[in-house]
């Protein structure tokens, strides 16, 4: 099962989505060598030319490292002794997206894995009551999604009924051209009732709670990456 | 600890050049960018440019390409920046400043004490 | 390149004041906005780095916020050590830049 008296090792990595113009994480562990001098990493691309990232002898090298990720990745070399190789990544671009390879080698052998980076926004919803209107609505807004997602609105007393004819959802482009700003308002809401405004792309799923009594607000918001694991 | 030491005060005339040293200790010199930033007298900070000392790449500020380089030399751990054809508004403190992050760019979390180029005729 | 315009240039407040001070970039949307303090014959210290991360060691009355193209540092309760100047750095970009800076002076 070895080759050159070396035997395969177990790498995993999971696919994860990155938030453009933020910081991301490309995930990958290994089996644990506690000689760091011995582990090499190493971050592929598919499609280019050159390392992604490469840590070796305790440090990084980057005399491979292709341009476009020049000052923009980092491992967490405190880390790499208990096998983790995840990849930081500065400022996630659209462009870089795609399959990337995570390969390790240690005195114990080596191995590789593929993972799947996605990139797009995504960002909560916050709805509130919107008193401007002529009759009670409510606004959900999000600061940063694309690609271009659905919006659907929901209400726990009238379960399963279709709000897209008492709702107008607009998207307006953010000022690096990108990214969106999504508003949705929902028209002759009632009191005494939860209402839920669902953002979704193939990256993200977002979700706004809002609970309007005579007394109160109650606002929750969640957001979950899709396809990950 | 973190520490950057910088070479002292210069003076020189309008048209020459002027070489700053950098000198840093308390980590691993090969692993962090070092970045270049300059203060003229009551005046705001200016990005020069920045090195990454294990692969000698650099960045730099449009305004002061061509006339500004940035080195490193690994055995001694220490960058160098090297400004030249001075003319009186260069007169400024320069501070060397190392970046989080390792070899990801990370803003400036540890500064030199600062070297004062003065340009006069 | 990514400009940062900070305002206001100076400001005069009392200790106990609630200070805000605000950078607009250029262009684009990143997190990579710090904020440094530098007193007279200093170098600048970081304060906050990615738009809200508090330097270790920075008192917790400075905090960062901020989203698109506005940034903002915000001093809660103003100490007599917090007079001094502030600048924004935008690092996100290939060319670092500063603002302008924002003189705090007691009133």
């Known amino acids: 099962f070895g080759i050159s008296g070396k035997h395969f090792i177990t790498v995993t990595t999971f696919t994860s989505a990155g938030n453009i113009g933020e910081d991301g994480t490309l995930s990958c562990t290994f089996e644990p060598d506690i000689k760091l001098n011995g582990i090499v990493i190493q971050w592929l691309k598919e499609g280019i030319k050159g390392l992604v990232h490469e840590f070796k002898e305790g440090k990084d090298d980057l005399s491979q490292q292709h341009e476009m990720f020049r000052g923009r990745t980092a491992v967490f070399a405190d880390q790499v002794v208990v096998g983790n190789a995840s990849l930081r990544l500065k400022n996630v671009q659209l462009t870089d997206a795609g399959t990337y390879t995570c390969y390790i080698h240690t005195s114990k052998g080596k191995g590789n894995a593929n993972l799947e980076y996605k990139t797009g926004a995504f960002s909560m919803p916050e709805i509130n009551v919107d008193y401007n209107a002529s009759s009670e609505s409510l606004r959900c807004e999000a600061p940063r999604w694309f690609p271009q997602p659905t919006v659907a609105w929901a209400s726990q007393v009238d379960q399963g009924a279709n709000f897209s004819e008492v709702s107008n959802t607009s998207f307006e482009l953010n000022s690096e051209n990108v990214t969106m700003k999504v508003v949705s308002v929902l028209y002759n809401v009632t009191i005494n009732n939860t209402y839920s405004c669902m953002i979704e792309n193939d990256i993200a799923k977002a979700t706004g709670d809002i609970k309007v009594t005579d007394s109160e607000v109650k606002r929750r918001s969640q957001l979950e990456l899709l396809n990950s694991g | 600890e973190v520490q950057l030491v910088q070479s002292g005060a210069e003076v020189k005339k309008p048209g020459a050049s002027v070489k700053v040293s950098c000198k840093a200790s308390g980590y691993t010199f090969t692993s962090y960018w070092i970045g270049w930033v300059r203060q003229a007298p009551g005046q705001g900070l200016e990005w020069i440019g920045d090195?990454?000392?294990?692969?000698?790449?650099?960045n730099y500020n449009e305004k002061f390409k061509g006339r500004v380089t940035i080195t490193r030399d690994t055995s001694t751990s220490t960058a160098y920046l090297e400004l030249s054809s001075l003319r009186s508004e260069d007169t400024a403190v320069y501070y060397c400043?190392?970046?989080?992050?390792?070899?990801?760019?990370?803003?400036?979390?540890?500064w030199g004490q600062g070297t004062l180029v003065t340009v006069s005729s | 390149d990514i400009q940062m315009t900070q305002s206001p240039s100076s400001l005069s407040a009392s200790v106990g004041d609630r200070v805000t001070i605000t950078c607009k970039a250029s262009q684009g949307f990143n997190k990579y906005v710090a904020w440094y303090q530098q007193k007279p014959g200093k170098a600048p210290k970081l304060l906050i780095y990615y738009t809200s991360t508090l330097q270790p060691g920075v008192p917790s009355r400075f905090s960062g916020s901020g989203s698109g193209r506005d940034y903002t540092l915000t001093i809660s309760s103003l100490q007599p050590e917090d007079f001094a100047t502030y600048y924004c750095?935008?690092?996100?970009?290939?060319?670092?830049?500063f603002g302008q800076g924002t003189k705090v002076e007691i009133k």
């Open positions: 750095l935008q690092y996100g970009d290939l060319l670092y830049a």
């Open positions: 090195i990454y000392p294990g692969g000698g790449y650099t």
């Open positions: 400043a190392r970046l989080d992050g390792s070899s990801y760019r990370g803003a400036m979390d540890s």
